[in-house]
């Protein structure tokens, strides 16, 4: 997977550390053509005008409908790799010619990432890390996946689950030395099928904060300490992924 | 102690291919990326590519990447960079660093000489 | 692929001067910026990571700053010892670029 890149659609840097939640998180990635609604730029999540709506996101601060996304990311934009065997495809060798959607300027492709796909986090992650993924769940899905990787550990597993028993979950947990923990489980279920969906993930001094289309939905202690070793995000599941970036703020 | 200690300087022909090593010590080598850079004499860096220990993923600098291929050992915590159809223009000092921000360290270099 | 630019190769200072050596993406990197220290006939070293983080045991005299396409390395009282190239990188997209480096010497 070369040349691929943060989205180039980041509203700068240098905020203050964000004060409480919800709330202003600052500068995150606004998103392949943003998203329509959000009353107060740069805001996070859904932050209205400082003053206004306070602890909560505005009315009407996440597009609901689908088309909410233009079809291809922003220039800039992680392409995904291409998909193979197993859960997260690895990229050992030079890719075959066509393994990647044709390309518009910085190497953005032009269509939408490949799932599973990896998120190369080559610092690791540390606190006000800022990570944003959006893209639309598949009509009839059953599951999306986000894998925190710590090496062949996973330190923040967040599975939304479409159809447990006849009832939606999001199962969080973490895997050590290939041992599952014990899991911690959130019935608030934010995702629709066939719908566009914003997912943050705030890295915390003890804790990742989720926040689902402008809106706080969970937090997860950390349980792998070494956050500096989390190096690698693995998103997977019945999704179409538009993009994925990181900044801090 | 993050320690990255990488093989010896080599004098190699013009054609052949050259595999430096880098040998990991001191933290978790499946849970940072390493990365190669190149440093010609006198002149400035550059970024040859990246390898996940963990699962092998690579993420190459376009401009090397018909030149050079990265692999590790996890049984021995080394990073391997092959170096093929050597030129002259590869002779230089190649560097593996680890990534991860906290530690961030370089090894010592290993100097490659390509001469007939 | 981005380009990093610092615009001075060689910075001339005196012991106890400030001095800032800049660094310029030719697009936005979102402040995923390192600075590194190579003083002759030594690996780099890295100073400062996410464009103002100071690596751990970096005197403070080091700081680094800076957002979107402009960042700076400043040294607040430059010591005999800071006699070094340094070089900028940005680790926002692959290939992970770095400047073409600045010399700094020491009058």
């Known amino acids: 997977a070369d040349n691929f890149s943060l989205h180039d659609a980041l509203s700068g840097s240098g905020n203050p550390n964000p004060q409480g939640w919800p709330g202003a998180w600052g500068n995150q990635p606004a998103g392949a053509g943003g998203y329509p609604g959000a009353s107060y730029p740069g805001a996070y999540p859904g932050q209205a005008p400082p003053g206004a709506y306070p602890g909560q996101a505005p009315p009407g601060a996440y597009p609901g409908a689908p088309g909410a996304y233009p079809g291809a990311p922003a220039p800039g934009v992680y392409p995904g790799p291409p998909s193979g065997p197993g859960a997260y495809p690895s990229s050992g060798q030079p890719s075959a010619t066509g393994a990647y959607p044709a390309t518009g300027p910085y190497g953005a492709p032009a269509g939408p990432l490949i799932v599973p796909y990896n998120l190369p986090l080559p610092g690791g992650v540390v606190p006000r890390m800022l990570i944003t993924i959006l893209g639309t769940v598949k009509p009839n899905a059953n599951r999306i996946a986000l894998d925190f990787q710590r090496g062949n550990d996973v330190a923040f597993h967040f599975n939304p689950r479409f159809n447990e028993n006849n009832r939606r979950v999001i199962v969080c947990n973490t895997k050590l030395d290939n041992n599952w923990g014990r899991e911690e489980r959130q019935s608030v279920f934010p995702f629709e099928s066939g719908k566009p969906f914003k997912i943050q993930v705030l890295v915390e001094p003890d804790h990742f904060k989720v926040a689902v289309n402008d809106a706080h939905l969970l937090q997860y202690n950390h349980r792998v300490k070494k956050l500096n070793e989390i190096s690698k995000l693995g998103i997977s599941g019945d999704i179409d992924l538009t993009s994925a970036s990181y900044t801090m703020i | 102690q993050v320690q990255l200690q990488q093989s010896g300087a080599e004098l190699v022909r013009p054609g052949a291919s050259v595999k430096l090593s880098c040998k990991a010590s001191g933290y978790t080598f499946t849970s940072s990326w390493m990365n190669w850079v190149k440093q010609r004499p006198g002149q400035g860096l550059d970024w040859i590519g990246m390898?996940?220990?963990?699962?092998?993923?690579?993420h190459y600098n376009q401009m090397f990447k018909d030149k050079a291929t990265l692999t590790v050992d996890k049984s021995s915590n080394t990073a391997y960079m092959q170096l093929s159809r050597l030129t002259s223009e590869d002779s230089a000092v190649y560097y593996c660093v680890n990534s991860n921000y906290e530690s961030g360290y370089w090894g010592q270099g290993t100097t490659l000489t390509v001469s007939s | 692929d981005i380009l990093m630019t610092q615009s001075h190769k060689f910075m001339s200072t005196s012991v106890g001067d400030r001095v800032s050596i800049t660094c310029k993406a030719s697009q936005d990197v979102s402040s995923v910026v390192v600075w590194y220290q190579q003083k002759p006939g030594q690996s780099p070293k890295q100073l400062i990571y996410?464009?103002?983080t100071r690596h751990t045991g970096v005197p403070d005299r080091f700081t680094g700053s800076g957002s979107g396409t402009d960042y700076t390395l400043t040294i607040s009282s430059v010591q005999a010892e800071d006699l070094a190239l340094y070089y900028c990188?940005?680790?926002?997209?692959?290939?992970?670029?770095f400047g073409g480096g600045t010399k700094l010497e020491i009058k």
């Open positions: 990188q940005q680790h926002y997209s692959t290939p992970y670029t």
């Open positions: 996410w464009a103002s």
């Open positions: 390898i996940d220990p963990s699962d092998s993923e690579t």
